[in-house]
């Protein structure tokens, strides 16, 4: 997150981190039920760990943290690397969470976000993609949903209904390491960090997010059948 601020502790209890090895954070994730996470499909790895209820970037133990293994990763069937369409993936964890003030699921928005909606994006990603600086704690940033026209003008030929743009204030953006993390609008999960230009936070090159309202049925059906 570029030019965000430290999240209040436990204010994003649905925020998850996907880790390679003991502590290599490579993507964010979102808790949507006691045993299921959403993340970006491009975050798929054969083996990874899941950390919930953690505030710090460092591996230091925190009392609210809960660690899990992913036992099933189900990318959306319409996702195809290196494209960005349908960039979401369900992860089933090896057990259910212990519900606490630090770890709680978020409800997915059924209605699509409209232009001007204020949302919160969060993550432990780099705070400057040109220098790869990382925050000490989870970062939060208020962003604004942009019109479809403005989104398409920013990225001609690359935007479809499975995406929306948000941000566009120069110097404020999600960034590398934030992928798969939540965009929450009016208390509901509206999107996942997906892609954008490099480096992050450039004028007229907003962050692009997976448009979850288009996938509510697939998410529910997939969870029910697994």
């Amino acid at each position: 997150i570029v030019n965000g601020s430290d999240c209040q502790k436990d204010a994003q209890p649905w925020q998850g981190a996907l880790l390679l090895g003991p502590n290599k954070l490579y993507c964010g994730a979102v808790l949507i039920s006691p045993q299921w996470l959403l993340t970006a499909a491009h975050c798929r790895k054969p083996v990874f760990r899941i950390r919930l209820g953690h505030h710090s970037m460092s591996p230091v133990y925190e009392s609210g943290q809960q660690m899990f293994q992913g036992i099933k990763s189900i990318p959306h069937p319409g996702y195809s690397h290196p494209g960005h369409s349908n960039d979401l993936m369900l992860i089933k964890m090896n057990r259910k969470i212990r519900d606490s003030h630090s770890v709680k699921p978020v409800e997915i928005a059924c209605d699509c976000a409209t232009e001007g909606t204020r949302c919160m994006v969060s993550g432990w990603g780099t705070t400057s993609s040109s220098h790869n600086n990382f925050p000490k704690v989870l970062q939060c940033l208020n962003i604004t949903v942009l019109s479809e026209e403005r989104c398409k003008n920013s990225y001609p030929g690359q935007i479809d209904k499975t995406m929306f743009c948000a941000g566009d204030e120069e110097g404020r953006d999600s960034c590398q390491g934030d992928s798969g993390g939540p965009v929450v609008c009016n208390g509901k999960l509206q999107g996942l960090v997906s892609w954008g230009d490099f480096p992050c936070a450039q004028r007229n090159r907003p962050g692009v997010y997976t448009n979850l309202c288009e996938f509510v049925k697939w998410i529910k059906d997939t969870m029910n059948s697994n």
């Epitope: 502590n23 954070l25 460092s58 591996p59 960005h84 790869n132 990382f134 960090v193 997906s194 892609w195």
Partner: antibody
Framework: QVQLVQSGAEVKKPGSSVKVSCKAS????????ISWVRQAPGQGLEWMGG????????VYAQKFQGRVTITADESTSTAYMELSSLRSEDTAVYYC????????????????????WGQGTTVTVSS | DIQMTQSPSSVSASVGDRVTITCRAS??????LAWYQQKPGKAPKLLIY???SLQSGVPSRFSGSGSGTDFTLTISSLQPEDFATYYC?????????FGGGTKVEIK
């Protein structure tokens, strides 16, 4: 301009250990990966392992597992590579190198290549 | 571990020649490939990252291409300072293995 400055040449006996340092001058380690690469005389490059100084997480090539330890001190922007149970075939030039760690257009966090290298440290293992 | 196979192991060429070096990964690595140049007694120098992105300060006669398992480094018009050994490295997963190297020699 960041430079990686390594410690001086070492001559070691078989069975002993060597610890090579790598200090970043004019910059920081934060948000980078520091890798160690060695090159035996007349041979190619061999990746030994790397460390994410921000988390202290180190990863090693299987070949060196149990024999190499990579550490980093963020406060002094110095990384260390210690290789134990030395044998003659460990005679090589040892390089540290810095890699930017990021995704590209997607916003996952991953690697680029190693854009800044140390000058190399010659380690000779001989009885 | 992912094996990286470079070919040819050496190539003789003249100034002005177009030189192509290939690198094959034993499994798909998307675009997570870097190319380095090394001169005798010197540390390697990064030329290309993410398979095709030119590192800052590297002459545009160097270019990289490929994705998945097959990659190419091309020097469009060889210059005297380009005679060196070139290595590919996959940075997709650990250990970050190198190819065996290609020595570009003067014909």
């Amino acid at each position: 301009q960041v430079q990686l400055v390594q410690s001086g040449a070492e001559v070691k006996k078989p069975g002993s250990s060597v610890k090579v340092s790598c200090k970043a001058s004019g910059g920081t380690f934060s948000g980078y990966v520091i890798s160690w690469v060695r090159q035996a005389p007349g041979q190619g490059l061999e990746w030994m392992g790397g460390i994410f100084p921000i988390s202290g997480y180190a990863v090693y090539a299987q070949k060196f597992q149990g024999r190499v330890t990579i550490t980093a001190d963020e406060s002094t922007s110095t990384a260390y590579m210690e290789l134990s149970s030395l044998r003659s075939e460990d005679t090589a030039v040892y390089y540290c190198a810095r890699a930017s760690a990021s995704g590209y257009y997607d916003r996952s966090y991953y690697y680029y290549g190693m854009d800044v290298w140390g000058q190399g440290t010659t380690v000779t293992v001989s009885s | 571990d992912i094996q990286m196979t470079q070919s040819p192991s050496s190539v003789s060429a003249s100034v002005g020649d177009r030189v192509t070096i290939t690198c094959r990964a034993s499994q798909g690595i998307s675009s997570w490939l870097a190319w380095y140049q090394q001169k005798p007694g010197k540390a390697p120098k990064l030329l290309i990252y993410a398979a095709s992105s030119l590192q800052s300060g590297v002459p545009s006669r160097f270019s990289g291409s490929g994705s998945g398992t097959d990659f190419t480094l091309t020097i469009s018009s060889l210059q005297p300072e380009d005679f060196a050994t070139y290595y590919c490295q996959q940075v997709s997963s650990f250990p970050q293995t190198f190819g065996g190297g290609t020595k570009v020699e003067i014909k």
